[in-house]
């Protein structure tokens, strides 16, 4: 090989050992029979050399550094050439370095031809290994602007006082152009400006200078985003740290088109703006740090650019001003993560503060809009507390458990609407009366409606789930001893059409001791399946529940149990079932941990089924399923 560098070229070539590898044989650069592991060629020198091994690319790297001095004379602006040409260089991994020194008052602009650059974070590498490393200068200190690959959005980087640009090319890469040019600009009065151009939908991840180390003290860095007019941009901070400020405050500032409050100033911990139309700037401003304990300021953020949906231009009013103790959350429904680019899905408050989830609270009117490619990716969860503190005031008071129409009009599916019903302990109980009689969901007769009511205890220490109930059954009311949560859960978008079927009234009633009482009026046409609360986990210890089963005058009810035995094993106490005729008060008592369950039996009159649990042994719980059917009384069954 022969490398000759012209005297005025300001180019230095250095061939040196690369990352040490566990290669058995050493390799040398051979210069007139002399073996060496490093070769430096300066301007005006011409050197002939060879390598002592077949694959020097496994051992050596070549660095070609060109110093460009803009202090003492005019700057050679324009497209930057790879000199010497790659075809004249040995087949090694090569790094071309351009070190430009300029006055503080001069701005330097690096312009990247298409494909533009994509910034990578620590530990990431570029496919194919072509990497740009860009540094700036503050007085004598070198500041890393970032490491970049091809195929991104970064089109220009402006700096002042100098720039060091390194282009790393692996030995096998055919590239023979630098891919960038240098232009002079007026002073930018900050560390740097990075321009990021979006042609269409996509995202860009960007980082503050020196990331993941600290951003230089009291410096200013700006990103300019060029966004097509028909698209919208949203900013989210992926990672940030704040330093310890002595004076001034670290912040980000946005220049947003159409904003009357430019610049809009945000703390790094604030929700960042979204749904922005048109070009915008984002600037990171550092502070004067505490000399003893400076900490570090750093920021990694993402800009997501996507099509606005029809919904993003619509404003929805959610009026919770007349609601009390209510919170509404719009959030992403859980999905499997995909590796493809997925446009963001945001909900925006007042069209500007956009985030992946949003919680609205009662007492106000809220204006929201959406920036989302597909609103089925979101759902709503609402919680409302209805509590009674004074039993004298609440007794016999009723509340309607209905989803407010404002919520139903939103273009997002309702997932859960939960009412937490709280009563004074041992003073009052609750009764739930549905607008339409309810069916209990069982494996044997599942609910197939678009929504169900999930009823569970709301006492933290108590694990008691009464069951899931949907309209279209035989349960006329559910009485519960103490605090419960009633959750209306939807299962299909058709809930909006069926919303008229919802409707549950809760009333505060005098206290009673049983955990729950179900009032059932069976339908003549179908079996009524009923099961004990906490199905599959077992009725809690020492819990008592009852079913008040009405039998119409002209009918006979057949009560059938699913199993011959309950399988419950009591650790302490006994588990009982009492079946009592309501008219005659005649009752039969069955020991559930000893006796077989009764065979199918007929009741001519309304009757009670009461189940009281013992303290069961682990794994030997009390679960009971039974059903009631009606037949006309004309058949003589006596």
């Amino acid at each position: 090989f022969e490398i000759a560098l012209p005297r005025e070229s300001n180019i230095t070539v250095l061939i040196k050992l690369g990352t040490p590898t566990l290669l058995a044989k050493p390799c040398y650069i051979v210069i007139s029979k002399r073996h060496t592991t490093m070769l430096s060629i300066k301007p005006g020198e011409r050197i002939l050399f060879t390598f002592s091994c077949q694959s020097p690319e496994n051992h050596f790297v070549i660095e070609i550094q060109k110093n460009i001095d803009c202090m003492s004379g005019p700057c050679p602006f324009g497209e930057v050439q790879l000199q010497p040409s790659t075809s004249l260089l040995p087949t090694l991994n090569r790094t071309f370095i351009w070190d430009v020194k300029a006055h503080k008052s001069i701005g330097l602009e690096l312009q990247f031809s298409i494909p533009r650059l994509r910034q990578i974070g620590p530990g990431e590498s570029c496919p194919g290994g072509v990497t740009y490393s860009i540094s700036g200068r503050i007085d004598a200190t070198v500041v890393r602007i970032g490491t970049f690959c091809s195929n991104g959005t970064v089109s220009r980087i402006k700096m002042q006082e100098g720039v060091k640009m390194a282009l790393h090319l692996p030995w096998f890469h055919p590239r023979n152009v630098s891919g960038f040019s240098i232009a002079n600009r007026s002073s930018i009065k900050r560390l740097c400006i990075i321009e990021s151009v979006f042609e269409g939908e996509g995202s860009a991840t960007l980082m503050s200078a020196n990331y993941p180390e600290g951003f230089p003290e009291d410096e200013l860095m700006t990103w300019q985003f060029v966004i097509p007019a028909h698209l919208r941009a949203s900013v989210s901070f992926l990672n940030f740290n704040l330093s310890n400020c002595e004076r001034k405050e670290e912040r980000v500032e946005y220049y947003i088109p159409g904003s009357t409050t430019n610049p809009e100033v945000f703390k790094l911990e604030d929700k960042q703006p979204g749904n922005m139309a048109g070009n915008f700037n984002l600037s990171l401003q550092g502070c004067d740090q505490d000399a003893q304990n400076p900490g570090i300021l750093r920021l990694q953020f993402q800009v997501l650019v996507q099509h606005p949906q029809n919904e993003s231009n619509k404003i929805y009013v959610v009026d919770l001003s007349n609601e009390r103790a209510t919170s509404l959350t719009i959030e992403p429904r859980p999905v499997k993560q995909s590796r493809k680019f997925v446009p963001g899905c945001f909900v925006c408050l007042e069209s500007r503060t956009c985030s992946t989830n949003l919680t609205l609270t009662s007492g106000s009117k809220h204006k929201i809009s959406f920036l989302c490619d597909n609103l089925t990716r979101l759902w709503m969860n609402v919680e409302k507390n209805i509590s009674c503190t004074d039993h004298r005031y609440c007794q016999r008071k009723s509340y309607s458990l209905q989803v407010p129409s404002d919520i139903l009009h939103l273009p997002v599916e309702l997932h859960d609407f939960s009412w937490k019903l709280l009563v004074p302990k041992d003073r009052l109980s609750l009764v739930l009366v549905p607008a339409q009689k309810l069916q209990q969901h069982t494996h044997e007769k599942p609910c197939n409606t678009s929504f169900s009511y999930l009823v569970a205890s709301a006492i933290p220490s108590q694990d008691l789930y009464f069951g899931s109930f949907c309209p279209g059954g035989s349960i006329e009311q559910i009485q519960v001893k103490q605090n419960i949560s009633v959750t209306l859960r939807t299962f299909a978008p058709s809930f909006r059409q069926e919303a008229s079927r919802q409707g549950l009234t809760v009333s505060f009633i005098p206290y009673f001791k049983e955990e729950g009482v179900f009032t059932v009026t069976p339908d003549t046409k179908s079996k009524v399946y009923l099961r004990t609360p906490n199905w599959d986990r077992g009725l809690p210890s020492l819990t008592s529940v009852s079913w008040n089963i009405s039998v119409p005058r002209d009918q006979v009810a057949c009560l059938t149990f699913f199993k011959e035995r309950t399988g419950v094993v009591c650790q302490t106490g006994r588990a009982f079932m009492i079946i009592q005729e309501q008219r005659t008060r005649a009752e039969e008592i069955f020991s559930l941990d000893e006796d077989a369950l009764p065979k199918p039996r007929f009741h001519h009159h309304s009757f009670w089924v009461n189940i009281s649990n013992c303290s069961p042994a682990s794994g030997k719980q009390l679960d009971l399923l039974f059903w009631v059917t009606l037949t006309p009384r004309t058949v003589d069954l006596t």
Epitope: T50, S55, P56
Partner: nanobody
Framework: QLQLVESGGGLVQPGGSLRLSCAAS????????MVWHRQAPGKGREWVAV???????NYADSVKGRFTISRDSDKNTMYLQMNSLRPEDTAVYYC?????????WGKGTLVTVSS
Amino acid sequence: QLQLVESGGGLVQPGGSLRLSCAASGSDVSANGMVWHRQAPGKGREWVAVISSSGSTNYADSVKGRFTISRDSDKNTMYLQMNSLRPEDTAVYYCGVAHYGQTYWGKGTLVTVSS
């Protein structure tokens, strides 16, 4: 003098497969890195895949998951298995080897993907 000869090119329908070979003669290249480049009509040369002497591989994004580079050191030969071919894969494919700091190239083989 080290020489490289590519073979295996031809006309194939989109979605089809081809296997290119690159035979080296004049020197043992088992300890050398080898590479495939391609040049589409009217375009610049682009890197496709590379294989080191130890057998580690790297692919351009445009072919990742579709092309596989391999080598048979005993036969002094490198291969490029190309599956799920697309019209944009149409190009002259060149193989190269890094040998004593020089890159030696073959004359190329034409791959045409068309229906």
